[in-house]
């Protein structure tokens, strides 16, 4: 819920601090899933939905983009997942549950989701650090 | 016992550049963030810029142009280099620890004064 | 940039005696009922030593006497009572938002 205070209730130079160590692992995420899974797609079916509708400058969503990371976790590189989800811990609200999120069973449908899910982030982090670089909070 | 320890030449030419080291002991610099701020003659602190736990670098836009500031993990190690110094740049440089638990700098080095004259 | 502006820039008080230094900021650095303005001292030839962070907390090994009050863009930090090793300059330091920035620093004398 809005109202709700963050876990650690970070200041804008601490989520900046956050939003520069997400940015090289997520551009890296995905340009070596695009190398290793030539000719798929984008999927028009899934979107994550991470930035926070309820706050100017936007944040980032991040109880909205944590399940989708735990989700393709075990299909992707663990390794930098594991680094992406430690980052999203810092700035997840406290008590908002996390859905659960299910890849898709067909390999091609699911490498597809995955896809979409780093490109999307990647522009949420794009959009984010925008934000915090135009001026005042 | 967290030390910071800086050292560099004392006095830099005009144009030039300025390089220091931050040899830190007691901690890590792969955890936490790892700081340079300088202090000018008439006692104005100014805040430099960062590198993280990760090797990400952020600087402040006043300076972005001229400072790079890199680490050497196997010496645990940080350095700031400044280029194109000026008169304006005469100053004493400390290394500093971001401490998580304050967001403040816990520790800092004693400070390394540094004259760009000709 | 938030500005960070101090009072008074020097200060003189008797032995014994309190000290209060006033630092404001330009804009709130405030998030969530939390402050992040921090208190330092140096003293001469020394590096400066974090006294009092997020506005309220004492630093570990500092001293009881020291302590600091404030939210939003008001602080204060107070010295009582103030003893003959307090001569030093104080600044106020946000770290709030980017780039971080410093109060010009007031300097406590003994009268």
């Known amino acids: 819920s809005s109202h709700m205070a963050p876990t650690h209730q970070l200041p804008p130079s601490d989520v900046r601090k956050i939003i520069l160590e997400l940015q090289p692992l997520s551009r890296g995420l995905l340009e070596d899933y695009q190398k290793k899974e030539t000719g798929v797609p984008e999927s028009n079916r899934t979107l994550l939905l991470c930035l926070t509708s309820d706050s100017q400058p936007p944040r980032l969503n991040s109880s909205a983009i944590l399940p989708y990371f735990r989700a393709i976790r075990p299909l992707s590189d663990k390794n930098i997942i594991d680094k992406i989800i430690e980052q999203l811990d810092k700035l997840k609200f406290q008590h908002e549950p996390e859905t659960e999120i299910s890849v898709p069973a067909d390999t091609f449908e699911c490498k597809s989701f995955i896809l979409t899910i780093l490109q999307q982030f990647s522009a949420c982090l794009e959009s984010v650090f925008k934000s915090l670089n135009s001026g005042p909070q | 016992e967290v030390q910071l320890v800086e050292s560099g030449p004392s006095l830099v030419k005009p144009g030039g550049s300025l390089r220091l080291t931050c040899s830190v002991t007691g901690d890590s610099i792969t955890s936490g963030y790892w700081k340079w701020i300088r202090k000018f003659p008439g006692n104005k602190l100014e805040y430099m810029g960062y590198?993280?736990?990760?090797?990400?670098?952020d600087y402040n836009p006043s300076l972005k142009s001229r400072i790079t500031i890199s680490r050497d993990t196997s010496k645990n190690q940080y350095y700031l280099q400044l280029n194109s110094v000026t008169t304006e740049d005469t100053a004493t440089y400390y290394c500093a620890r971001y401490a998580n638990y304050g967001y403040a700098m816990d520790y800092w080095g004693q400070g390394t004064s540094v004259t760009v004259s000709s | 940039d938030i500005v960070m502006t101090q009072s008074p820039a020097s200060l003189s008080v008797s032995l014994g005696q309190r000290a209060t230094i006033s630092c404001r900021a330009s804009e709130s650095v405030d998030t969530y009922g939390r402050s992040f303005m921090h208190w330092y001292q140096q003293k001469p030839g020394q590096s400066p030593k974090l006294l009092i962070y997020r506005a309220s907390n004492l630093e570990s090994g500092i001293p009881a006497r020291f302590g600091g009050s404030g939210s939003g863009t008001d602080f204060t930090l107070t010295i009582d009572p103030v003893q003959a090793d307090d001569v030093a300059t104080y600044y106020c330091?946000?770290?709030?938002?980017?780039?971080?920035?410093f109060g010009g620093g007031t300097k406590l004398e003994i009268k």
């Open positions: 590198i993280s736990y990760s090797g990400i670098t």
């Open positions: 330091h946000q770290s709030y938002e980017d780039p971080w920035t």
